[in-house]
C-alpha cells in the first residue's frame, strides 16, 4: 500500500522542515522539577516499541509506522545500558536497583549494592541503597507505585525494598533460615520500610494470612492469603494513616480517587499479577491508565509535589510466553497511561521519563508490506516451503517440532491472541535481551537525558531534577508554580 | 565475575554524578557546520551496537559492557523510524534515499520518490530527489564516499544515483528494454551524475569492459570487467580532472592520500564488495579506518569544507549470513573509523552523525555471566537438553535440523568466525528488522538530533546545519575558523 500523498517529495520535505522547526525551538528548562514520574515498560526494548507503534496505529485504521505513540512525543532520548554487575543480560530486580536507586546490583537482588549476593540473607545488612522515591518522601513529596504486576514484584519493589531474593514476595517464600536471620519478605517491606501514599496493582495474596479467602475468588484456595506469620498487612497499613483506604475493585478505586478524605490509597486488584489487558474484566479491574489517573488525582494534592512509578509490567510476561499479541497490547495500554498522565500533568513542573528495564529476544522482520498486520506472515515462504511470521523470538516456548519439522502457520493462526511466535531455541520461558533500551524524557531537566548512559543515570537525573539527595545543592530555580 | 570496585555504591554514584556534570555542561553550538560526516552502519541495530560494545571491550581485556564505543561518546541520540513507503521493514536502497536525500522511497529503489516503482524504468524521470552530498558539492564543498561494500551498492548510491533497481550495478545488470528507455546503471551514474572528489571501496568489475582482467585476480574471469558498453569508466573519470588518481591497493592509497598533487581520488580495492575485516589482506586492501583517514586528508584541504559518507557496509552481510562474528567484527572496524575521524576533525566545525539504515532480527539473550564471550553459550540447557548460544536470529540460514532435531553446540563451535547462529525460521538470507535505529550526533547543530524522528530527518539536519538547500537562509553564525 503506497499512500498517494507520500509519493510527493513535498510531503517528506515539509514534514522534516516542521520537525526541524520543533527541534530548533526546544529550550532546556532551567527550573527544578516539582513532580517526578517514571514510566517503566518491563521488557519494552526498541523492537517492542516499534511493533507497538504499528499496532496502535493500525487500531486507529492507519497503516501503522507513521503514527506516534505518546512516548514518541517526548523530546529527549537516550540509550540506557542495562547489564547488571554480574550478568550481561539482566533481570528486573538488578535493573530496578539501577534506575530507581542509582546503583547497579546483582541478578535477582533488589535495592542492594553488588556487595550483596543472591539468596544469601547475611549479605543484606549494610548493603542497602536508597531509592529516589524514598528520598522524595523524605523531602516532603507524596509518592506512589502503580503496576500491572503484583506490587511486590521486582520492578516496583526497587522503589521501597531491599532483598537478596526477588522471589520473597511473602514470608511463605522466605526460607526459615533467612527469616531467622532477620530477612523480611517484600510485602512486609512494602508497608514498613517507608510511607507510600498510593499503592496500586496486584498482589493481594501476599498481604493476608494463609487461609484468608480472596474476595474475588473466595472458592479458589490457591488465590487466598499466603502469609505464615498470621499478619494482615493491609490492616496494619490502614492503621498507620487516618485517611488510608484499601480497595480491591475498579468501582471502589474510582470512588476513592475522587474522595478528598482519602490521603493514602492501596488498591490490590488481583491475588497475583493483574490480568493481561485483553483478559481484563473491566467491571472489576481497572486498567493501567485508570490506576495512573487515580494515583495522579491523589498525589497532585501535595503542594510539594510527588514521585510516581508507573509500570507496564506484563509486557515482559507476554514476551516470556512468546505471545507477542499479549506483549504488544500491554505496551499499548502502557502508552495509553503515559498519554493520560500527560493530560493530567504539566511539563512545566513535571519531569516524566519513559524507559524499559531490559529488552527481549523479540524481532520484527521479513519485509512485510506497509499496512499489513504486525501479527501476520512475511511475504513468500521459508526454505522449508512453509510460511513464517514477521514477529519471531530468538528463544522461548514457541519452538515446536511437528513430525520432526517446523510447523507451518496461517494468517489466522498467527493473529490469535494465544499464538506463540516460533523461536530458534526451545525454552520454557523466553529470555530477556541485553541490548540498550531507550529512555524518553520530557519536562524540567529532561535535556540531561542524552547520549548513551548507564541505567543508573536515570535515578540520578530524577534526583538532580527535583533537588533530592545527594543533589540538594542542585542550584536550580524553583519549579514553576511551586507553593513552597 | 563481579568487579570488586563495582560492589561499592560510591562507584556508581560517582560515575553518575560525573555523567550528570557532563550533561549539564552540554552547550548547543549556534554555529553552522563547515563539514558534514555521516557514518552509516548498514544493518547496525541497537542489538548490534550493544554486542559490538561488549566484544570491543573484551578485545581490550575488559569485561565488556562497561566500555565505550566511539559512537557511545557522541552527546546526542535520537531514534529513527526506518520503514519505507511500501514496506514496514525496509531495504538499504529506500533507506539511503531517506537519510541522504530527505525523502522516503519504495523498497529497492534509490534516489527516487515513492512515485517511482521498483524495476519500472519509465517511472524514473521526474521523480529524482537530490542528495545532501550533491547539494554540498553545489555549495563548493568537497565530497566523498567511503564504503566496505562495492561503491555502487545501495547505501553509497543514495548519495549520487537515481535508479528504480538497486541491483543495476553495471549495464550488464540492466535489462535491454530499460537501457533503451535511457535508464543508466549505477556505475555510470557514479562518474557522470556529479563530481565526487573521493570514492573509496569495492566495485572494480563494474567499471571496466567485459573481458578486462582484474589486476588482483587476473586469472579469475568472474572477477574481471562486466560492462557490455565497452566503456572504461575509471579512464573516463580520470580524464575529467587533472589531479585525479585511481588506486587499487593499500600502498597506493596511503601514498595518494598524502600527495598534495592529488585532488580527486578513486580507490577500488576489490572486484565486488571488499573482504570482511577478518579476511582482509592488510598488505593489499586498506581497512575502513584507513580509507576514512585517506578521505579526510584529501577533503579537509577545501577551506569551504566537505561532506563525507562512510559506510560499514558489511555489518549487514554478516547478519544476512547469520554469522554474528563477521557482523560484530565489521561493527568494531566501523567504530574504529569513527574514532579515527574524531582524531582528524574538530567538533567545533564538523557535524558527525552515526546511524544505521535498518536493523536485523538479531538478539542477545540467555542471561550470560558478565565477562563471558559474546559468542558463547547461555548458562544451562534448553528444553531439548542441548546447549544454546546467547546470540540468535529470528530467521536465517543458521536454522538446521539434524536427525529431525535442533543440533547441539559447543563453546568452541560457537566461537568460530564461520559459525552461523541458529534461527527460528530457515531462510537463505536472514532478513532486516523493522525496529527504530539509533542516531548519534556530535558537532554544530547536533542538538537538533532528538526524540523519535522519521529517517528523512537526518538529511534535513545535515542540510540545515551546513546551510545547504533548502536551508540556505539557515540564520546560523558562520562556523568557527571559516575562511570563506
Amino acid at each position: 500500500i503506497i499512500p498517494v500523498e507520500e509519493e510527493n517529495p513535498d510531503f517528506w520535505n515539509r514534514q522534516a522542515a516542521e520537525a526541524l522547526g520543533a527541534a530548533k525551538k526546544l529550550q532546556p528548562a532551567q527550573t527544578a522539577a516539582k513532580n517526578l514520574i517514571i514510566f517503566l515498560g518491563d521488557g519494552m526494548g526498541v523492537s517492542t516499541v516499534t511493533a507497538a507503534r504499528i499496532l496502535k496505529g493500525q487500531k486507529k485504521d492507519k497503516l501503522g509506522p507513521e503514527t506516534f505513540l505518546a512516548m514518541d512525543r517526548f523530546p529527549y532520548v537516550a540509550l540506557s545500558k542495562t547489564y547488571s554487575v554480574d550478568k550481561h543480560v539482566p533481570d528486573s530486580g538488578a535493573t530496578a536497583t539501577a534506575y530507581l536507586c542509582g546503583v547497579k546490583g546483582n541478578f535477582q537482588t533488589i535495592g542492594l549494592s553488588a556487595a550483596a549476593r543472591f539468596n544469601q540473607c547475611n549479605t543484606t545488612r549494610g548493603n542497602e541503597v536508597i531509592s529516589v522515591m524514598n528520598r522524595a518522601k523524605k523531602a516532603g513529596k507524596s509518592v506512589g507505585v502503580v503496576t500491572t504486576t503484583r506490587v511486590q514484584h521486582a520492578s516496583p519493589a526497587g522503589a521501597y525494598a531491599h532483598t537478596v531474593n526477588r522471589n520473597w514476595y511473602s514470608d511463605a517464600d522466605v526460607p526459615a533460615s533467612a527469616r531467622q536471620e532477620g530477612c523480611q519478605d517484600i510485602a512486609t517491606q512494602l508497608i514498613s520500610n517507608m510511607d507510600i501514599d498510593v499503592i496500586l496493582g496486584g498482589g493481594r495474596k501476599y498481604m493476608f494470612p494463609m487461609g484468608t479467602p480472596d474476595p474475588e475468588y473466595p472458592d479458589d484456595y490457591s488465590q487466598g492469603g499466603t502469609r505464615l506469620d498470621g499478619k494482615n498487612l493491609v490492616q496494619e497499613w490502614l492503621a498507620k494513616h487516618q485517611g488510608a483506604r484499601y480497595v480491591w475493585n475498579r468501582t471502589e478505586l474510582l470512588q476513592a480517587s475522587l474522595d478528598p478524605s482519602v490521603t493514602h490509597l492501596m488498591g490490590l486488584f488481583e491475588p497475583g499479577d493483574m490480568k493481561y489487558e485483553i483478559h481484563r474484566d473491566s467491571t472489576l479491574d481497572p486498567s493501567l491508565m485508570e490506576m495512573t489517573e487515580a494515583a495522579l488525582l491523589l498525589l497532585s494534592r501535595n503542594p510539594r509535589g510527588f514521585f510516581l512509578f508507573v509500570e507496564g509490567g506484563r509486557i515482559d510476561h507476554g514476551h516470556h510466553e512468546s505471545r507477542a499479541y499479549r506483549a504488544l497490547t500491554e505496551t499499548i495500554m502502557f502508552d495509553d497511561a503515559i498519554e493520560r498522565a500527560g493530560q493530567l500533568t504539566s511539563e512545566e513542573d513535571t519531569l516524566s521519563l519513559v524507559t524499559a528495564d531490559h529488552s527481549h529476544v523479540f524481532s520484527f522482520g521479513g519485509y512485510p508490506l506497509r499496512g499489513s498486520s504486525i501479527f501476520g506472515l512475511a511475504p513468500g515462504k521459508a526454505r522449508d516451503r512453509k510460511a513464517y511470521t514477521v514477529l519471531l523470538y530468538g528463544n522461548g516456548p514457541g519452538y515446536v517440532l511437528k513430525d520432526g519439522a517446523r510447523p507451518d502457520v496461517t494468517e489466522s493462526e498467527s493473529g490469535s491472541p494465544e499464538y506463540r511466535q516460533q523461536s530458534a531455541v526451545p525454552l520454557d520461558g523466553e529470555t530477556h535481551a541485553g541490548e540498550d533500551v531507550a529512555v524518553f524524557a520530557r519536562g524540567p531537566q529532561a535535556h540531561l537525558v542524552h547520549g548513551v548512559q548507564e541505567q543508573t543515570f536515570i535515578a540520578h537525573v530524577m534526583a538532580f531534577a527535583a533537588c533530592l539527595e545527594p543533589y540538594t545543592a542542585c542550584d536550580l530555580a524553583p519549579r514553576a508554580g511551586t507553593t513552597d | 565475575i563481579i568487579p570488586v570496585e563495582e560492589e561499592n555504591p560510591d562507584f556508581w554514584n560517582r560515575q553518575a554524578a560525573e555523567a550528570l556534570g557532563a550533561a549539564k555542561k552540554l552547550q548547543p553550538a549556534q554555529t553552522a557546520a563547515k563539514n558534514l560526516i555521516i557514518f552509516l552502519g548498514d544493518g547496525m541495530g541497537v542489538s548490534t551496537v550493544t554486542a559490538a560494545r561488549i566484544l570491543k571491550g573484551q578485545k581490550k581485556d575488559k569485561l565488556g559492557p562497561e566500555t565505550f564505543l566511539a559512537m557511545d561518546r557522541f552527546p546526542y541520540v535520537a531514534l529513527s523510524k526506518t520503514y519505507s513507503v511500501d514496506k514496514h521493514v525496509p531495504d538499504s536502497g529506500a533507506t539511503a534515499t531517506a537519510y541522504l536525500c530527505g525523502v522516503k522511497g519504495n523498497f529497492q529503489t534509490i534516489g527516487l520518490s515513492a512515485a517511482a516503482r521498483f524495476n519500472q524504468c519509465n517511472t524514473t524521470r521526474g521523480n529524482e530527489v537530490i542528495s545532501v552530498m550533491n547539494r554540498a558539492k553545489k555549495a563548493g564543498k568537497s565530497v566523498g564516499v567511503v564504503t566496505t561494500t562495492r561503491v555502487q551498492h545501495a547505501s553509497p548510491a543514495g548519495a549520487y544515483a537515481h535508479t528504480v533497481n538497486r541491483n543495476w550495478y553495471s549495464d550488464a545488470d540492466v535489462p535491454a528494454s530499460a537501457r533503451q528507455e535511457g535508464c543508466q546503471d549505477i556505475a555510470t551514474q557514479l562518474i557522470s551524475n556529479m563530481d565526487i572528489d573521493v570514492i573509496l571501496g569495492g566495485g572494480r568489475k563494474y567499471m571496466f569492459p567485459m573481458g578486462t582482467p582484474d589486476p588482483e585476480y587476473p586469472d579469475d574471469y568472474s572477477q574481471g570487467g562486466t560492462r557490455l558498453d565497452g566503456k572504461n569508466l575509471v579512464q573516463e573519470w580520470l580524464a575529467k580532472h587533472q589531479g585525479a588518481r585511481y588506486v587499487w591497493n593499500r600502498t597506493e592509497l596511503l601514498q595518494a592520500s598524502l600527495d598534495p598533487s592529488v585532488t580527486h581520488l578513486m580507490g577500488l580495492f576489490e572486484p565486488g564488495d571488499m573482504k570482511y575485516e577478518i579476511h582482509r589482506d592488510s598488505t593489499l586492501d586498506p581497512s575502513l579506518m584507513e580509507m576514512t583517514e585517506a578521505a579526510l586528508l584529501l577533503l579537509s584541504r577545501n577551506p569551504r569544507g566537505f561532506f563525507l559518507f562512510v559506510e560499514g557496509g558489511r555489518i549487514d552481510h554478516g547478519h544476512h549470513e547469520s554469522r554474528a562474528y563477521r557482523a560484530l567484527t565489521e561493527t568494531i572496524m566501523f567504530d574504529d573509523a569513527i574514532e579515527r575521524a574524531g582524531q582528524l576533525t574538530s567538533e567545533e566545525d564538523t557535524l558527525s552523525l552515526v546511524t544505521a539504515d535498518h536493523s536485523h532480527v538479531f538478539s542477545f539473550g540467555g542471561y550470560p555471566l558478565r565477562g563471558s564471550s559474546i559468542f558463547g553459550l547461555a548458562p544451562g540447557k534448553a528444553r531439548d537438553r542441548k546447549a544454546y548460544t546467547v546470540l540468535l536470529y529470528g530467521n536465517g540460514p543458521g536454522y538446521v535440523l539434524k536427525d529431525g532435531a535442533r543440533p547441539d553446540v559447543t563453546e568452541s563451535e560457537s566461537g568460530s568466525p564461520e559459525y552461523r547462529q541458529q534461527s527460528a525460521v530457515p531462510l537463505d538470507g536472514e532478513t532486516h528488522a523493522g525496529e527504530d535505529v539509533a542516531v548519534f550526533a556530535r558537532g554544530p547543530q547536533a542538538h537538533l538530533v532528538h526524540g523519535v524522528q522519521e529517517q528523512t530527518f537526518i538529511a534535513h539536519v545535515m542540510a540545515f546545519a551546513a546551510c545547504l538547500e533548502p536551508y540556505t537562509a539557515c540564520d546560523l553564525a558562520p562556523r568557527a575558523g571559516t575562511t570563506d
Epitope: - | 582524531q343 582528524l344 576533525t345 567545533e348 568557527a480
Partner: antibody
Amino acid sequence: QEQLKESGGDLVKPGASLTLTCTASGFTLSTYWVCWVRQAPGKGLEWIGCIDTVSSGDTYFASWAKGRFTGSKTSSTTVTLQMTSLTAADTATYFCARRTGSGWTLWGPGTLVTVSS
Amino acid sequence: LVMTQTPSPVSAAVGGTVTISCQSSQSVYNNNYLAWFQQNPGQPPKLLIYWASKLASGVPSRFKGSGSGTQFTLTISDVQCDDAATYYCLGAYVSNGWYFAFGGGTEVVVK
C-alpha cells in the same frame, strides 16, 4: 589512572645508538598515535615523529630525523624510538605524548638523553 | 612547516590580559589544527587549547584560542600568578606525510 612513562634515557658517547620506550598504563595504545618530542636544555620543544598505533604502525618523522630515528609499536602498551648516530646536539629530554581527537592530551614526564664523550 | 611565535618575554600584571600570536608558514591541516601548550620548568607541556579554539578538559575559561588558516592567537584574560610559564603553539599539515611543528615558545612573566 591513565599515564605514559618514558624509559631508556642514558649517557652515551657520540655515534652510539639508543632505544627509548614509552609505556602506557591504564589504557592500551590500540586507537591512538604516540608522538615523540624533545627539548634541549634551556630550549624549546621540537617534534621528532609519530607512530600510528592503530593501523600497521605507520610512522611519520620530521625531515631532520628521517634515517637516524625510527619508531615502532612493540606491544599494546609500548612504543619505542630507536636513535642512531647520536651527536651532542641530540642531548635533550625526550617526551612521548598521546594524540587523540582532543589534542595531545597525555604526556610522559620525560627521560634525559645525554650525548657526551 | 614553520611556526613563528610572539617573541619572549611578554609581561602582564595580575588581572590583566596577555595575547600571544602564532603564525604558520602555510595553512594548517583543516585550517584549524593548532594547539597551545603551557610548560613550567622541569614539567612536560600541558595542553590548553586544541583545534585552534577548543578548551582542553580542566583548563580555566580565562584561556581562549582563536584564528584560522595561518594566523592564530592565545589570549589569557584575568592573568594569575601561576600563569607565568612558557607557551608553545603546535601546528600540523599533510603533504607526503604528516608534519608537526612547535613554535619557538613565548615566556609570560607576571608582575
